[in-house]
């Protein structure tokens, strides 16, 4: 059962796992949600009736029954983790805490103009978990405007105290706002020889990398595969750090793999969701339950639905016994990972999918595409929407992309002459325009947010957000696309597609079926040569064949240039402008979305 509200002046008795410090009960709830075992918590607020050393304590708790006895206590605030809830969860915390000093290891001290600048510094520093900033009113002259970057083993403060004229806050890495590089490569036959901060068991290097990503201190990792010579180290995932933030030594070793934390790209790739099955693999751990199940998929469902289950092993049925049902062992451990991994015993293992909701919805795998052909199939581009105007008559106006459950990203030039959002209708999950009838459900538009530097498509800033009147329920036919990571600026995308219902030639009409075309990206230097009369800025991205023939055209505007990278689709461009359509040596020009990630997040996350 999902309980989101906080219980004031209430304390849960017993079940303690650990105590951390958090600046608010709300953040305590987030910490509890991300902890592998925490189901309930009790937070102590500042209060004259409480011992100041207990202020801001967040006691993480567990219970076999998923609840604990309640006791009345002034200043105590209790609640449940969001593990029991189905809604999307985020660790992003933009709150600034006034007159609080969050204690940790002060590893960097510098002057900053504002708390915001200090927070940005923390977000772009690989080690920083949180910061404290002394304002210009701080009593001690030499400490005024000082920005202290801090880290701890747990990622949360070691203590929190009241201190006048300072403010504290957390790194915004988990809000996708870091400019740090996003290095997704996994290096085979490589060991990083730096200090280990922790070690866990993992079935493969990908899971190891994802564990490193959501471990507060891990910057990179080394994984020993099941073929590693030393038996005791097989399937061992070593979580590592270094002072520089990079591995100091790389050693060539067969059967080992190494890689980096994906912290800077975690909003656009799954880091909590381990969805694979591991055949002929047994996960060991504390047994929670043994249930009969028809298949390993059914076993995974059972684990996902049991809130305390973290991983499972399924042993298929022997011949015809037990109605063809096998045994499903639901398991847990102190850190969420198996205590040991064994091979060759016939089991099929995997993880709960309960944590998938902590990942961005946009990372969910979608239907495999149909290669070749220009007409799309249903569910192939589930983020693509058709934006209709009702003026003078109802018609397709522009394309757009779902980037959040209330947000569509599109082009600013689509709204020339549109005086009110009320006259617009957004249709999602559409393949053919002919499906849209008078009674077809649509999303009304609450607000049109056009970039304030936009003047005309050719001069850039051709980007706009539509805030919908109601939220989109994600399904196979309507779901978001990931924004590119700022850390991915140097990625070379090779699998890019433009989609839309636009014209197929310059003098044509809107197409009935959603069209698709695979188009190569063109460097900005090359693109500039093709458009001598225009300035192709770094905020634009170009795509097209030298010989022409495939391109976006009228009616495709605002739609996505979608590129697949590491099995995840990213919204790399927004169809903006071009000279004619599909002309030789005239690539299409798109808004370069990565350059607007801050703007998008600022607008969509505004309170």
């Amino acid at each position: 059962e999902c309980v989101t509200q906080l219980l004031k002046d209430t304390c849960f008795e017993g079940g303690d796992i650990t105590t951390v410090f958090t600046p608010s009960a709300k953040y305590c709830q987030v910490v509890c949600t991300y902890h592998p075992r925490c189901l309930l918590f009790t937070f102590t607020a500042e209060s004259p009736s409480e011992d100041p050393t207990r202020w801001f304590t967040c006691v993480l708790k567990d219970s076999v029954t998923e609840t604990l006895p309640r006791v009345n206590r002034t200043a105590a605030i209790s609640g449940y983790s969001f593990k029991q809830c189905s809604h999307q969860i985020s660790a992003c915390n933009k709150d600034i805490y006034v007159d609080l000093d969050m204690k940790g290891i002060n590893y960097n001290s510098s002057v900053a103009k504002s708390a915001q600048e200090c927070q940005e510094r923390c977000t772009d520093d690989v080690h920083c978990h949180f910061f404290t900033y002394a304002t210009r009113q701080f009593p001690s002259l030499e400490h005024r405007n000082i920005c202290l970057l801090k880290h701890t083993q747990t990622g949360t403060p070691t203590r929190i105290t009241k201190l006048d004229k300072v403010v504290s806050g957390f790194s915004l890495k988990s809000c996708a706002l870091s400019n740090l590089a996003c290095i997704r490569d996994i290096f085979p036959n490589t060991v990083f020889a730096d200090s280990n901060i922790d070690s866990v068991m993992a079935p493969d290097a990908f899971v190891c990398g994802r564990i490193c990503t959501h471990h507060p201190g891990c910057l990179f990792f080394t994984f020993f595969s099941q073929e590693w010579p030393k038996e005791s180290q097989r399937n061992l995932c070593l979580l590592k750090t270094s002072e520089s933030g990079l591995p100091s030594t790389r050693i060539k070793k067969s059967k080992a793999l190494s890689g980096f934390s994906l912290q800077s790209c975690r909003h656009s790739i799954p880091v909590f969701c381990h969805s694979s099955f591991y055949h002929d693999t047994d996960f060991l751990g504390e047994e929670l339950d043994i249930v009969a199940a028809k298949s390993h998929e059914a076993c995974q469902k059972l684990c996902t639905n049991a809130v305390r289950c973290q991983f499972f092993t399924y042993t298929p049925a022997q011949a015809s016994c037990n109605e063809g049902k096998g045994k499903c062992y639901l398991k847990l451990s102190s850190n969420g990972s198996p205590t040991k991994i064994l091979h060759g015993r016939g089991g099929i293992s995997g993880y709960t999918l309960r944590l998938c909701k902590m990942d961005n919805e946009c990372t969910t795998k979608i239907k495999p595409r149909i290669v070749g052909g220009t007409a799309s199939v249903r569910g192939e581009w589930p983020w693509q929407v058709t934006l209709h105007t009702t003026s003078p008559t109802q018609r397709h106006l522009c394309g757009g992309s779902i980037i959040g459950n209330q947000w569509i990203l599109t082009a600013a030039h689509c709204f020339y002459g549109v005086e009110s959002p009320k006259i617009l209708r957004v249709y999602s999950g559409i393949l053919n325009q002919s499906e849209i009838k008078e009674d077809t459900s649509f999303f009304g538009v609450q607000e049109i947010i056009i970039h304030d530097q936009y003047k005309m498509a050719e001069s850039g800033y051709d980007i706009a957000l539509l805030k919908l009147e109601t939220t989109v329920n994600y399904t196979d036919s309507q779901r978001p696309i990931c924004l590119p990571s700022k850390g991915d600026r140097n990625v070379i995308y090779t699998d890019c597609w433009v989609t839309g219902w636009g014209y197929r030639k310059l003098r044509d009409k809107i197409q009935n079926t959603l069209q698709k075309a695979k188009i190569p990206l063109v460097t900005n230097e090359e693109c500039q040569k093709r458009y001598r009369g225009h300035k192709i800025t770094h905020k634009m991205i170009c795509a097209g064949y030298r010989e022409g023939g495939k391109d976006a055209c009228k009616g495709d505007s605002g739609g996505p240039l979608s590129c697949k990278h590491n099995e995840v689709w990213h919204l790399v461009g927004i169809t903006s402008w071009g000279e004619g359509c599909a002309q030789r040596e005239r690539p299409g020009v798109y808004t370069n979305v990565v350059e607007y990630v801050d703007w998008i997040l600022e607008k969509t996350q505004a309170v």
């Epitope: 009702t390 003026s391 003078p392 008559t393 109802q394 018609r395 005086e419 009110s420 959002p421 009320k422 006259i423 009838k437 008078e438 003098r507 009409k509 809107i510």
Partner: antibody, heavy 117, light 107 residues
Framework: QVQLVQSGSELKKPGASVKLSCKAS????????MHWVKQAPGQGLEWIGN????????NYDEKFRTRATLTADTSTSTAYMELSSLRSEDTAVYYC??????????WGQGTTVTVSS | NIVMTQSPSSLSASVGDRVTITCKAS??????VSWFQQKPGQAPKLLIY???NRYTGVPDRFTGSGSATDFTLTISSLQAEDVADYHC?????????FGQGTKLEIK
């Protein structure tokens, strides 16, 4: 069922103003554009303008922009057209019509306006 | 402004005849053309929308065709009750405009 009921005939002197009404029922008034069309005796149809009741967005033909004012009262689902500085050539039947999904699908019965001294 | 030129301005035909009325737009209006029927003393009624889609309840002897600039309304077999004025109109762009109308009579 969708119905548009217009106000009764009007006899006006040149220079005067007239305000015609069009009461809508049977559909969500705020979600459809309401258009006004003029038909002079023995002539074709002439578009005056339209209004979107949910936002009061309006469009006018240049010819009528200075003299026609379109308004809507969402509480009573009624659209209005006021025509000022009347002259003899304004003598006509005025229709309100709903712009449906793709076309003007429902029309009022029309209001006859006669401008005569 | 887009000018819609309708022809003929009047025509007389016998019951059972095939009747064609044309409408020419001064610029491309894609398929944003509607046809209306107006009987004496009545308001216009929608017959065809989107150049070729028959509106609900309209007999299938009425057919619309065309795109871009040239549009046609065809009555495959004229009936006595089809005596009326017929108007074409474009809703591609503001200001919306209509043809001058065609008066259809029975011989």
């Amino acid at each position: 069922q969708v119905q548009l009921v217009q106000s009764g005939s009007e006899l006006k002197k040149p220079g005067a103003s007239v305000k015609l009404s069009c009461k809508a029922s049977g559909y969500t008034f705020t979600r459809y554009w309401m258009h006004w069309v003029k038909q002079a005796p023995g002539q074709g149809l002439e578009w005056i303008g339209n209004i979107y009741p949910d936002s009061d967005s309006t469009n006018y033909d240049e010819k009528f922009r200075t003299r026609a004012t379109l308004t809507a009262d969402t509480s009573t689902s009624t659209a209005y057209m006021e025509l000022s500085s009347l002259r003899s050539e304004d003598t006509a039947v005025y229709y309100c019509t709903r712009m449906g999904f793709y076309a003007m699908d429902y029309w009022g019965q029309g209001t006859t306006v006669t401008v005569s001294s | 402004n887009i000018v819609m030129t309708q022809s003929p301005s009047s025509l007389s035909a016998s019951v059972g005849d095939r009747v064609t009325i044309t409408c020419k737009a001064s610029e491309n209006v894609v398929t944003y053309v509607s046809w209306f029927q107006q009987k004496p003393g009545q308001a216009p009624k929608l017959l065809i929308y989107g150049a070729s889609n028959r509106y609900t309840g309209v007999p299938d002897r009425f057919t619309g065709s065309g795109s871009a600039t040239d549009f046609t309304l065809t009555i495959s077999s004229l009936q006595a009750e089809d005596v009326a004025d017929y108007h074409c109109g474009q809703s591609y762009s503001y200001p919306l405009t209509f043809g001058q109308g065609t008066k259809l009579e029975i011989k």
